[in-house]
Every structure is written in structure tokens, then in C-alpha cells.
């Protein structure tokens, strides 16, 4: 099983140019306990919360968010109403943070592709998204053949590559940035020149939120090494300007629940300070 990933896609609505929708999804085996959508940067690092979605408690959203909803068990959408005439959303970064069990907290950011035509963005799917400016160049069959061939090639290459191991890290503040899966030259033209950067940051974990089953988060002492798309055939290629920031929080089971606990709260590894939440406090 590959490293969990988060994808983000920003779409401008074809009918109303002032309306935008942010789609986010989590690609991983764990169960999602909380999703936070922010704009202007990652949550807790200069970003402003737009919505918080709990899989059972409900959603909370704030202007300019119009409607936040779960699209599937592992993906959400957030409709935004742009009241301004100059459409500030077009140049804004939107970030989605998924707190999941047992993987921890994973965040990804993205913005509207610079050359995007309203309504042309394909809806997010759990398979690689092929974004071509010249859509007519590649027929559907060509795309499928190319995709299958490329996947087979990657899988064959993966067989001969040593498996990445967990790298122990003894510094909580350590950050590791690596270029991930640069697409081949042939595919770059067809794939709208996409790229993605995996940014793995290790933070002292604070119990901003805790798991419904009373699991607690400890400071991370190990991190997943980034893997390319060969690790998972269902990795979408992120639109240009996106990056994947992986905050890897390892969970350990707390012996007993705290005296006062809240519903299904999620643990977010967090670099904002030592204040810890003693309950399973989550986001609303």
C-alpha cells in the first residue's frame, strides 16, 4: 500500500464566473475523522479556515463558503461565492487537511489552473486526472492506451526498485522536501505540464483534536518517505501550482480516555505550540 495522499482541485463554474468549487479527496486506507478547508495557505500557517467537516457531527462553514458537503466517504466539495468583481479566488491557494486514522494528518493545497476555461475542468476522480489544453490531440482510446502502458511501465520499474523504508527522525522540527514523480517528457505535453512536490514536515503533535476511540497523538519520530505514483495506481496528478504537504502524525493508543471527552475528535499534528487538548476534541 502506498503513502496516503490528498488531492485538491479548484474549478470555476461555467454558469457563474463568480462561483468556484474546491474539491478535495483522500487517497488512503484510513478512516477520515475530520477535514479542514482553508484559503491563503495551510491551516495554522497563515491560512484562514473556510469549512470544517466531520463525517458524523456535521459541517461548519464561513463566508465566502456557500456550501460544504461530503461527496463520498473520502472526498468533499466546497462551493464558494465570490462577491467581488475582480474574482480574488482565481489567484488564491486553497488547502485541504484530512485527519485520518491511523495515518495522521495530511494536507494538500492547490489553486485554479492559470489557463483553465470555466467548466472545462474534469470532476475529481480517484484515477489520474489527464488535463490537456489541446483535448482534441489525444482521443479517448489514445489516452487509455497511453495510461495503461505508462502504468505498466511504472509497475515494472517499481518491481526492480528497493522498497522505501521508514526513516527515523529524531528532530521534531525537521522538514524534508523532495521532488515527486516528474512525468516523462512525452507525458508532460499531454498532461498540462503538471508537477507535485511532497513536503513532509514533522511537528510536535498537539491534541487539537483526538480520535473518537480515544487514540492520542504523540510527537512524530518516523516519517513516510515520499513515493511516486507507481506506489498507487489511483494517484491523481495535481494541477500546476499545487503541492502536497504531508504532515505525518503517528498515533498511539492512550490507555484510558480522559475524564471529559468529545465526539470523534481528530488529532492534528500541529506546530503552533504546546497547548494540548486533553479530550478527543475535534473540529466542528
Amino acid at each position: 500500500a502506498g503513502t496516503p495522499e490528498v488531492w485538491v482541485q479548484v474549478q470555476m463554474e461555467a454558469t457563474e464566473l463568480s462561483s468556484f468549487t474546491v474539491h478535495c479527496g483522500f487517497l488512503g486506507p484510513g478512516s477520515i475523522s475530520l477535514v479542514t478547508v482553508s484559503w491563503g495557505g495551510p491551516d495554522g500557517a497563515g491560512g484562514t479556515k473556510l469549512a470544517v467537516l466531520h463525517p458524523e457531527l456535521g459541517t461548519r462553514q464561513w463566508a465566502p463558503a456557500r456550501q460544504a458537503r461530503w461527496e463520498t466517504q473520502s472526498s468533499i466539495s466546497l462551493a464558494l461565492e465570490d462577491s467581488g468583481a475582480s474574482s480574488p479566488f482565481a489567484n488564491t491557494t486553497f488547502c485541504c487537511k484530512f485527519a485520518s486514522f491511523p495515518e495522521g494528518s495530511w494536507e494538500s493545497c492547490g489553486s485554479l489552473p492559470p489557463s483553465s476555461d470555466p467548466g472545462l475542468s474534469a470532476p475529481p476522480t480517484p484515477v489520474p486526472i489527464l488535463r490537456a489544453d489541446l483535448a482534441g490531440i489525444l482521443g479517448l482510446s489514445g489516452v487509455l492506451l497511453f495510461g495503461c502502458g505508462y502504468l505498466l511501465h511504472l509497475l515494472r520499474r517499481q518491481k526492480h526498485r528497493p522498497t522505501p523504508r521508514l526513516q527515523p527522525s529524531h528532530t521534531n522540527s525537521q522538514a524534508l522536501t523532495a521532488q515527486a514523480w516528474a512525468p516523462s517528457q512525452a507525458s508532460q505535453a499531454a498532461l498540462h505540464d503538471p508537477y507535485a512536490t511532497i513536503n513532509t514536515s514533522f511537528c510536535p503533535a498537539t491534541l487539537d483534536t483526538a480520535h473518537p476511540n480515544g487514540w492520542a497523538s504523540l510527537p512524530t519520530h518516523a516519517a513516510h518517505q515520499p513515493q511516486g505514483p507507481a506506489a498507487s495506481a489511483s494517484t491523481p496528478i495535481l494541477a500546476r501550482g499545487s503541492f502536497v504537504s504531508v504532515e505525518n502524525g503517528l498515533y498511539t493508543q492512550a490507555g484510558e480516555r480522559p475524564p471529559h471527552t468529545g465526539p470523534g475528535l481528530t488529532l492534528f499534528p500541529d506546530c503552533r505550540g504546546p497547548r494540548a487538548l486533553e479530550g478527543r476534541f475535534g473540529v466542528r
Epitope: T48, K49, V52, G58, R69, Q73, L277, F281, R284
Partner: antibody, heavy 114, light 113 residues
Framework: EVQLVQSGAEVKKPGSSVKVSCKAS????????IEWVRQAPGQGLEWIGE????????NYNEKFKGRVTFTADESTSTAYMELSSLRSEDTAVYYC???????WGQGTLVTVSS | DIVMTQSPDSLAVSLGERATINCKSS????????????LAWYQQKPGQPPKLLIY???TRESGVPDRFSGSGSGTDFTLTISSLQAEDVAVYYC?????????FGQGTKLEIK
């Protein structure tokens, strides 16, 4: 332990304003909304609105728009609800709550009487 | 706004017997995307704030005794106390957690017969 501690009971004249405080502890204050709910004597629960500390983003129940103001002070982890143009029917216990109504303050009784 | 209607308004049940409270919403509380029902149940004792018992229509909050259970989907929901205890005497509220504004039922007063 997550705690929400509210200010004490208030007696107000019709037409005046009241400001109720709610001090949060045990979690990162800016992470979650503070909700405000009221309960008139012998009646049910009525949502007034919410504020997200940090960004100070708010949502209001239409019924209270224009009469209620939410503020939050991150330095003291305290949220405030101010209700103006008070009338006798605003007599109620006012609660602050957080995290999808999982945590509640003890309530503040506001009595509006001439 | 979604209107939440509870029945009955009051209920008297003998100790050890089953108590059932119903809640009906004016719109569906089911999110088709993740197939979750956004309904919560609260218990309120005199002089105290409400206490969350059940969320997601059927998920019991941590620390809530397993005699409390929630069921239902869409617009019709039920809170069941399988064996009534003296400490369960309270007013129970259902709440729409599906969409703004959050709305509560009028409450059901549960007493011992």
C-alpha cells in the same frame, strides 16, 4: 479537560444591551467555533449563531441578525456575545458551546425586566 | 430552516422498561455522498446544560451508557433507552446537524411512572 466557563447572571432593562463572556480552556481556542444557544424558561433550545476565533468569521441565525454581535479574544481564549435592544422575551439562559455542541458552558441567566 | 418535531411531548415509563422518543425532520438529514445522517440527541437535566448523547443518528458519544441507542434515516429518527434508570429522568432533544441553522426539536420530557 475541555472547559467553557461563562460570566454570571445579569438583570437588564428593556432597550439596553448585555454582553456575556465564555472562557475556553483545554484546547486550542482558534481551532473550533464557539456556538451560542439560548433557552427561555421552560422552553427549548434556540441557536443564536457562532464565531470562529482567529479569523472572527461568524454565522448568525437570521432571527438575531442586527441585534447580536460575536467577538473573540484569542489572547484570553474568551468569546463574547452582545445582544442589544433587549426585550422581555430575551429573558433566557444563554449557553456557549463548542465542537458541534459536545462541550457546553454552565449557562448565563439574562433577565430583562423593567 | 429545517423543522424538527418530537413525539411525544412527555413520556412516563417504569424503571427497567423501554423508553422510545421519536423525532421527525421537515427535510432529509441524510447526506447522499457519504450516506451519513446528520442528527444528534441531547439529554438535559434541570439546571444543567444539554449533554450530547448520540451523533450521526446512531453513534453513541463516549461515556454514554449502552442502554441509549439511536436509529433511523432520512426524516424519521428514534432514541431508545432499553432499560430506564432513575438518572435518565430528563428532557431529551433531537437536533438537525445537516444544514444551517442548527435547529432543535421542542423536547420530550421523560419521567418515571
Amino acid at each position: 479537560e475541555v472547559q467553557l466557563v461563562q460570566s454570571g447572571a445579569e438583570v437588564k432593562k428593556p432597550g439596553s444591551s448585555v454582553k456575556v463572556s465564555c472562557k475556553a480552556s483545554g484546547y486550542t481556542f482558534s481551532s473550533f467555533s464557539i456556538e451560542w444557544v439560548r433557552q427561555a424558561p421552560g422552553q427549548g433550545l434556540e441557536w443564536i449563531g457562532e464565531i470562529l476565533p482567529g479569523s472572527n468569521s461568524t454565522n448568525y441565525n437570521e432571527k438575531f441578525k442586527g441585534r447580536v454581535t460575536f467577538t473573540a479574544d484569542e489572547s484570553t481564549s474568551t468569546a463574547y456575545m452582545e445582544l442589544s435592544s433587549l426585550r422581555s422575551e430575551d429573558t433566557a439562559v444563554y449557553y456557549c458551546s463548542s465542537y458541534w455542541f459536545a462541550y457546553w458552558g454552565q449557562g448565563t441567566l439574562v433577565t430583562v425586566s423593567s | 430552516d429545517i423543522v424538527m418535531t418530537q413525539s411525544p411531548d412527555s413520556l412516563a415509563v417504569s424503571l427497567g422498561e423501554r423508553a422510545t422518543i421519536n423525532c421527525k425532520s421537515s427535510q432529509s438529514l441524510l447526506n447522499s455522498g457519504n450516506q451519513k445522517n446528520y442528527l444528534a440527541w441531547y439529554q438535559q437535566k434541570p439546571g444543567q446544560p444539554p449533554k450530547l448523547l448520540i451523533y450521526g443518528a446512531s453513534t453513541r458519544e463516549s461515556g454514554v451508557p449502552d442502554r441509549f441507542s439511536g436509529s433511523g434515516s432520512g426524516t424519521d429518527f428514534t432514541l431508545t433507552i432499553s432499560s430506564l434508570q432513575a438518572e435518565d429522568v430528563a428532557v431529551y432533544y433531537c437536533q438537525n446537524a445537516h444544514s444551517y441553522p442548527p435547529t432543535f426539536g421542542q423536547g420530550t420530557k421523560l419521567e418515571i411512572k
